[in-house]
Interface confidence: low
C-alpha cells in the first residue's frame, strides 16, 4: 500500500498590534496536540497594513475596511480555508489609541466599533478588539521574549537554540519602544516591588514569577518628540527652532495645531505668537541630549528610587532584550552588535547626527525622508532612555541585547497575548507522556 | 455606563454555603481587578479576597480554604464562592473594581451589595 | 501584615469647621493609600488615592497627604453632606489583605 501524507493537525491565531504610528498582522501556528508545551508556536507571517494608526482614522472611520482589507486577504491566504472558522483573531489596541481615549472615549469607541465590525465580516472566529492597558503591554512583551527563548521550560539543554541562550532559566527582562508609549518589564532580584500598579504575579509552568513592569505614556520616541518640540519652542525666541537633534541643514515646518494636537504636549502648551515655526537642524548629539533630559522629571521619587517622574523602578536584574522601536532604530544605526559598547554608540551617534542633512540624504537614498530625518532624534532618545531613564551603566549596557526576531518570530507584545488568550501557557507544569517530544529530534 | 452589580445574597443555614456574582459591564476584566469588601451590620469595611487582570488571586488569611474568588471574563462576571457559613459573616458583600492588579490607587468603582444573611 | 490604625473613631464637629482624620500604617505603604466616604446604607465612596490625589468628581476641599506610614485625610471646612463614616486603605500589598482598611472613623454633628 501507498504510504498517504496525513493532513497536518495544526492551528493558527491572528493577532493585529494597532500601534500609534502603524497596524501590523501576525499570524501564529503551533501543532494541536502540543498546545501547552512551551516554545511551540511560532509565527508564520507578518503583514503590515498600508498607512498610519488607527487612531488617525477618527475624522475618517469609514474608511478603517478598505485599510485592513490587504492583510486580512492575506491572512486568508495563508491559513488553509479548512482552518478559518477556528482562527481566532484578536486585535490590541496599544499608547496611540489609549492617547484617543483620554481626549474622548466616544471617538475611542467609534474607532474601535468600525474595526470591529470590519473583522467580523471575514470568515475567522473573531475575538474582539480592545486597547490593552500599558501593563499589559508589558507583561505579553515579558511572557513573549521568554516564550521563545525557552526561559518557561524546565528540561535544561546542552545546546543553544537561540543566540541569546545562556542556558539558565533566568529570565530576560523586556524593552519595548513603540511610538507612543515605552515599557520596561523585568523579574527584580529579591526587591519589594513598593508600588502595586508595577507589580505582577504569575504563575507559568509550574514556577511563580514576581515580575516589576512600567508603561510610560507619551514617553513613545515620536510622543518624545513632540513632547521635545513643544518644550523647546516655548523658549524659542522666534519662530525659528534649532533644533541639535535633526542634522545640519536640516528644514522642517511644523504647525503649532499639530504640535499641541497630542495630549502628551499639554503640559508644555502657551499661546505662541505664530501658526507655524521652522525647525532648522544644528546636529549636535550633546545638546540633543540635554534637550532630551528635561522630559524626565528625576528631582522628585517617592520610592527608595525611581525611573522619572516619581514612578518606582527597582535595580536593574539580568539581561534584557530590547525591540520594537529599540531594535528597528539601533539596526539602521548598525549599532545592535553585541560587542559595541555603550561608549562606542555614543562616539558613533556624535558622528550621525553632526553630518550633514544632504550628505545622509544622498547616502540613505532608499529611505523615506520622514523616518530618515528622525533617526538622529531617536537614538539620542533610546541612549537617553536607557542610560538616564532607566539608569543603566556603561557596564550594564552589555546586558542589553536589541532583539528583531527569535527563532523566526518577532519580540512583542502579540505572541504572548495571543497565548494568554488561548489559554496556552499553563499555570502548571504539563505532564509529559511517553513518547510526547519524540519530534523534536 | 461602568457598573458592578452582586447578586447571589440570601439567607442561608449556618454550615452552608452560597456563591456571589458581580456581575461587571461597561469595562473588561482583562483590565481591572476586581475585590470583595463585607460589611457586618454595624461595623467597618473587611476586605475578602482579590482577583487582578491576569486571573491571580489573593485572600485575607480568614478567608483561605473557606472562600473562592474566580472569574468568567465571557461572561463579565467575578464570582465568591463561600462555604462553612457563620452567624459572625452576615453581612453587605460589595465587589469592587481597582486598577490593572489591584488597588493601588483605590477602589474608585462599587456595587450597591447584596447582603447575605446567615441564620437557623 | 498591615495594620491600619484610624483616629479619632468618632468626631463631633460643626459646618464650617476645619476637620482632619489621620491613619497610621504598621509598615511602610509608600504612597499607596487611599481614602473613602461611607454613608449609612450606601456603598463607599473613593475620595483619595495614591495619598493625596483627588479622586473624579470630588470636590476640592478635600484633601490628602503623608507617605510611608502616616496619612491624613483634611476637609478645609465641612459641609452638611460631609457627615458620614470615613476609611483609609493600604494599596500597597495584596498578599496580606487582611487589615487593608482602617477602623473607619465617624464624622458627627456637633
Known amino acids: 500500500t501507498q504510504n498517504k501524507a496525513l493532513p497536518e493537525n495544526v492551528k493558527y491565531g491572528i493577532v493585529l498590534d494597532a500601534g500609534s504610528s502603524h497596524t501590523s498582522l501576525y499570524i501564529y501556528k503551533w501543532p494541536a496536540e502540543k498546545e501547552n508545551d512551551t516554545g511551540v508556536v511560532h509565527q508564520v507571517e507578518e503583514c503590515r497594513v498600508k498607512g498610519p494608526g488607527i487612531s488617525k482614522f477618527v475624522q475618517k472611520v469609514n474608511e478603517i475596511g478598505i485599510y485592513l482589507t490587504d492583510c486580512m486577504e492575506r491572512a486568508r491566504e495563508v491559513i488553509p480555508r479548512s482552518q478559518h472558522q477556528e482562527t481566532p483573531v484578536y486585535l490590541g489596541a496599544t499608547a496611540g489609541m489609549r492617547l484617543l481615549r483620554m481626549e474622548s472615549e466616544e471617538l475611542a469607541d467609534r474607532v474601535l466599533d468600525v474595526v470591529e465590525r470590519s473583522l467580523s465580516n471575514y470568515p475567522f472566529d473573531f475575538q474582539g478588539a480592545r486597547i490593552i492597558t500599558g501593563q499589559e503591554e508589558g507583561a505579553y512583551g515579558w511572557i513573549t521574549i521568554n516564550y521563545l527563548l525557552g526561559k518557561f521550560s524546565q528540561k535544561t539543554r546542552w545546546f543553544s537554540i537561540v543566540p541569546y541562550e545562556t542556558n539558565n532559566q533566568e529570565t530576560f527582562g523586556a524593552l519595548d519602544l513603540g511610538g507612543a508609549s515605552t515599557q520596561v518589564t523585568f523579574v527584580p532580584q529579591n526587591q519589594t516591588i513598593e508600588s502595586p500598579d508595577n507589580a505582577l504575579q504569575f504563575r507559568l509552568y509550574g514556577k511563580d514569577y514576581n515580575v516589576y513592569t512600567h508603561s510610560f505614556l507619551c514617553y513613545g520616541k515620536d510622543q518624545a518628540l513632540w513632547q521635545k518640540l513643544a518644550k523647546d519652542i516655548q523658549v524659542a525666541s522666534n519662530e525659528i527652532l534649532r533644533d541639535p537633534c535633526f542634522h545640519p541643514g536640516y528644514k522642517k515646518v511644523v504647525n503649532v495645531s499639530d504640535l499641541y494636537k497630542t495630549p502628551c504636549t499639554k503640559r508644555f502648551e502657551m499661546t505662541l505668537p505664530f501658526q507655524q515655526f521652522e525647525i532648522q537642524g544644528i546636529g549636535n548629539y550633546q545638546q540633543c541630549h540635554q534637550s532630551i533630559l528635561e522630559l524626565f522629571n528625576t528631582s522628585y521619587c517617592p520610592y527608595s528610587q525611581c525611573a522619572f517622574n516619581g514612578i518606582f523602578l527597582p535595580p536593574l536584574q539580568g539581561d534584557f532584550g530590547a525591540f520594537s522601536a529599540f531594535y528597528f532604530v539601533m539596526k539602521f544605526l548598525n549599532l545592535t552588535s553585541e560587542k559595541v559598547s555603550q561608549e562606542k554608540v555614543t562616539e558613533m551617534m556624535k558622528k550621525f547626527c553632526a553630518q550633514p542633512w544632504e550628505e545622509i540624504k544622498t547616502s540613505y537614498a532608499g529611505v523615506k525622508e520622514k523616518y530618515l530625518s528622525e533617526y538622529c532624534f531617536s537614538g539620542t532618545y533610546i541612549l537617553s532612555l536607557l542610560l538616564q531613564g532607566y539608569h543603566f551603566t556603561a557596564d550594564s549596557w552589555e546586558h542589553i541585547h536589541f532583539i528583531g526576531k527569535i527563532q523566526g518570530s518577532d519580540a512583542g507584545w502579540t505572541l504572548g497575548y495571543m497565548l494568554n488568550l488561548t489559554n496556552m501557557i499553563p499555570a502548571e507544569q504539563p505532564l509529559s507522556t511517553p513518547l510526547s517530544h519524540s519530534t523534536y529530534v | 455606563e461602568q457598573q458592578l452589580v452582586e447578586s447571589g445574597g440570601g439567607l442561608v443555614q449556618p454550615g452552608g454555603s452560597l456563591r456571589l456574582s458581580c456581575a461587571v459591564s461597561?469595562?473588561?476584566?482583562?483590565?481591572?481587578?476586581i475585590s470583595w469588601v463585607r460589611q457586618a451590620p454595624g461595623k467597618g469595611l473587611e476586605y475578602i479576597a482579590i482577583?487582578?487582570?491576569?486571573?491571580?488571586?489573593y485572600y485575607a488569611s480568614w478567608a483561605k480554604g473557606r472562600v473562592t474568588i474566580s472569574k468568567d471574563s465571557s461572561k463579565n462576571t467575578v464570582y465568591l464562592q463561600m462555604g462553612s457559613l457563620r452567624a459572625e459573616d452576615m453581612a453587605v458583600y460589595f465587589c469592587?473594581?481597582?486598577?490593572?492588579?489591584?488597588?493601588?490607587?483605590?477602589?474608585?468603582?462599587w456595587g450597591p451589595g447584596t447582603l447575605v444573611t446567615v441564620s437557623s | 501584615d498591615y495594620q491600619m490604625t484610624q483616629s479619632p473613631s468618632t468626631l463631633s464637629a460643626s459646618v464650617g469647621d476645619r476637620v482632619t482624620i489621620t491613619c497610621q500604617a504598621s509598615?511602610?505603604?509608600?504612597?499607596?493609600l487611599a481614602w473613602y466616604q461611607q454613608k449609612p446604607g450606601k456603598r463607599p465612596k473613593l475620595l483619595i488615592y495614591?495619598?493625596?490625589s483627588l479622586a473624579s468628581g470630588v470636590p476640592s476641599r478635600f484633601s490628602g497627604s503623608g507617605s510611608g506610614t502616616e496619612f491624613t485625610l483634611t476637609i478645609s471646612s465641612l459641609q452638611p453632606d460631609d457627615f458620614a463614616t470615613y476609611y483609609c486603605?493600604?494599596?500597597?500589598?495584596?498578599?496580606?489583605?487582611?487589615?487593608?482598611f482602617g477602623g473607619g472613623t465617624k464624622v458627627e454633628i456637633k
Open positions: 509598615q511602610n505603604i509608600y504612597s499607596n
Open positions: 495614591r495619598a493625596s
Open positions: 461597561g469595562f473588561s476584566l482583562s483590565s481591572y481587578a
Open positions: 469592587a473594581r481597582g486598577d490593572s492588579y489591584g488597588s493601588g490607587v483605590g477602589l474608585g468603582l
Open positions: 486603605q493600604q494599596g500597597f500589598s495584596s498578599n496580606n489583605v487582611d487589615n487593608t
Open positions: 482577583i487582578n487582570s491576569y486571573g491571580t488571586t
